[in-house]
């Protein structure tokens, strides 16, 4: 088996505090998924990350950091159009049981006002495995830069699995990608949240197989309406 890069897949530790909106969804003490803080009460993640109860880690790039905030959450709202068969509309809002305390290390993500075009450089982050198929989970938040790929080019790889609210990102001939455990985490482009990690080819990091993300710019109305409805 070809050796993989030793971060996210082929990434590096994020600059400390550079992703203050990044959260981890834990099941007990174990990483389940990534997510992003939308405001003091709400986290946005992938619908396929649904559990009955969550522990949300905020405010530190290091899992297990005692200075981090840990907040329980027991209510979550999947997009009503989410399908376990087609993976379309793979997003979900998680309502925190108590408010997050905003600080230099805990900030709200900027939701997009527009969809960024193919070719845009973006950063994906998470605590997901840094090796594949065998797993190695880091304690520090990892980042990798990828570029948005046009739906036409991505369809050449994934054919009819690709739906129009999915977004692809990667680097040609590179292993740079997200992997298991990064699900629900952010793809940030020019300071706004453009994607949530959804799926990709396994083992991770196969050159020319882009990562697939939920295209957040298509769902801002649903996000805002859902938070308002369940205030």
């Amino acid at each position: 088996e070809e050796a993989q890069g030793d971060k996210i897949i082929d990434g590096a530790p994020c600059a400390r505090g550079s992703h203050p909106w990044q959260v981890a969804l834990l099941s007990g003490n174990q990483l389940h998924c990534g997510g992003v803080l939308v405001n003091e009460r709400w986290v946005l993640t992938a619908a396929h990350c649904k559990m009955n109860e969550y522990t949300v880690h905020l405010g530190s790039d290091t899992l297990g950091d005692r200075r981090a905030q840990r907040i329980k959450a027991s209510k979550s709202f999947r997009h009503p159009g989410y399908s376990t068969q087609t993976h379309v509309n793979d997003l979900m809002l998680v309502k925190l049981n108590s408010q997050a305390r905003l600080s230099s290390m805990v900030k709200k993500v900027r939701l997009p006002s527009r969809c960024e075009p193919p070719g845009t450089t973006c950063t994906v982050s998470g605590w997901g495995t840094t090796t594949s198929p065998d797993v190695t989970f880091p304690s520090d938040l990892m980042c990798v830069d990828v570029k948005l790929i046009s739906p036409q080019d991505c369809t050449k790889v994934y054919k009819d699995l690709l739906e129009n609210s999915m977004l692809c990102a990667g680097i040609p001939d590179s292993k740079k990608n997200a992997c298991n455990g990064d699900s629900g985490g952010p793809l940030v482009c020019r300071g706004t949240l453009q994607g949530l990690v959804s799926w990709g080819t396994f083992p991770c990091g196969q050159p020319n197989d882009p990562g697939v993300y939920t295209q957040v710019c298509k769902f801002t109305k649903w996000i805002n309406d859902t938070m308002k409805k369940h205030r």
Epitope: A46, T84, V135, C204
Partner: antibody, heavy 128, light 108 residues
Framework: QLQLQESGPGLVKPSETLSLTCTVS??????????WVWIRQPPGKGLEWIGS???????YYNPSLKSRVTISVDTSKNQFSLKLSSVTAADTAVYYC????????????????????WGKGTTVTVSS | DIQMTQSPSTLSASVGDRVTITCRAS??????LAWYQQKPGKAPKLLIY???SLESGVPSRFSGSGSGTEFTLTISSLQPDDFATYYC??????????FGGGTKVEIK
């Protein structure tokens, strides 16, 4: 290396519930995005997929058996289990557990998988 | 459900023969096909996945080909250890996974 071992009663009475457990050793059942799978083979016949589970607890069942099947996972014991209710003689088979290797991870990890590691199988006879 | 039809159901051959087994899907499954070998009283063993990828540790005399609806498993030079039953499995639809009826390769 990874090994799977089925266990459970070899004889079940008609109308009762068949219960089997698969113990995974040499690796963690929590290693997403693998699928943990049950397959059966009636005497002298071919293979039939029963269903599968992810470590998160998401389950996928054969529609022909869905109303009678429950698959569950216990990550703390590194085990997953099969329950098949209201059994008849037609459920007499060798039952195998296996690991399913997916083509995709994340939202698509329950989808498009083949089995690379199998248990030895356990024979279950349904008879009064 | 996608039906998988294997042919022949039984095949008589000698050591050293080139053996070909065919599997047809009732609808296109792209390259999502696996081949397994099963010996009496034993669990199936993975030989080929994604139609043509050889599983680690499987002898190179085994090869797979095909895409869409028609697939073949070829054993280039049959060895004594290869007398067994072979199954194809489609994993190209979300549910259920389905297997072919099996091909028994027996000594001529």
């Amino acid at each position: 290396q990874l090994q799977l071992q089925e266990s459970g009663p070899g004889l079940v009475k008609p109308s009762e519930t068949l219960s089997l457990t698969c113990t995974v050793s040499g690796g963690s059942i929590s290693s997403s995005p693998y699928n943990w799978v049950w397959i059966r083979q009636p005497p002298g016949k071919g293979l039939e997929w029963i269903g599968s589970i992810l470590h998160s607890g998401s389950t996928y069942y054969n529609p022909s058996l869905k109303s009678r099947v429950t698959i569950s996972v216990d990550t703390s014991k590194n085990q997953f289990s099969l329950k098949l209710s209201s059994v008849t003689a037609a459920d007499t088979a060798v039952y195998y557990c296996a690991r399913g290797v997916p083509t995709y991870w994340g939202a698509a990890s329950h989808y498009y998988y083949y089995m690379d590691v199998w248990g030895k199988g356990t024979t279950v006879t349904v008879s009064s | 459900d996608i039906q998988m039809t294997q042919s022949p159901s039984t095949l008589s051959a000698s050591v050293g023969d080139r053996v070909t087994i065919t599997c047809r899907a009732s609808q296109s499954i792209s390259s999502w096909l696996a081949w397994y070998q099963q010996k009496p009283g034993k669990a199936p063993k993975l030989l080929i996945y994604k139609a043509s990828s050889l599983e680690s540790g499987v002898p190179s005399r085994f090869s797979g080909s095909g895409s869409g609806t028609e697939f073949t498993l070829t054993i280039s030079s049959l060895q004594p250890d290869d007398f067994a039953t072979y199954y194809c499995e489609q994993y190209g639809s979300e549910s259920p996974l389905t297997f072919g009826g099996g091909t028994k390769v027996e000594i001529k």
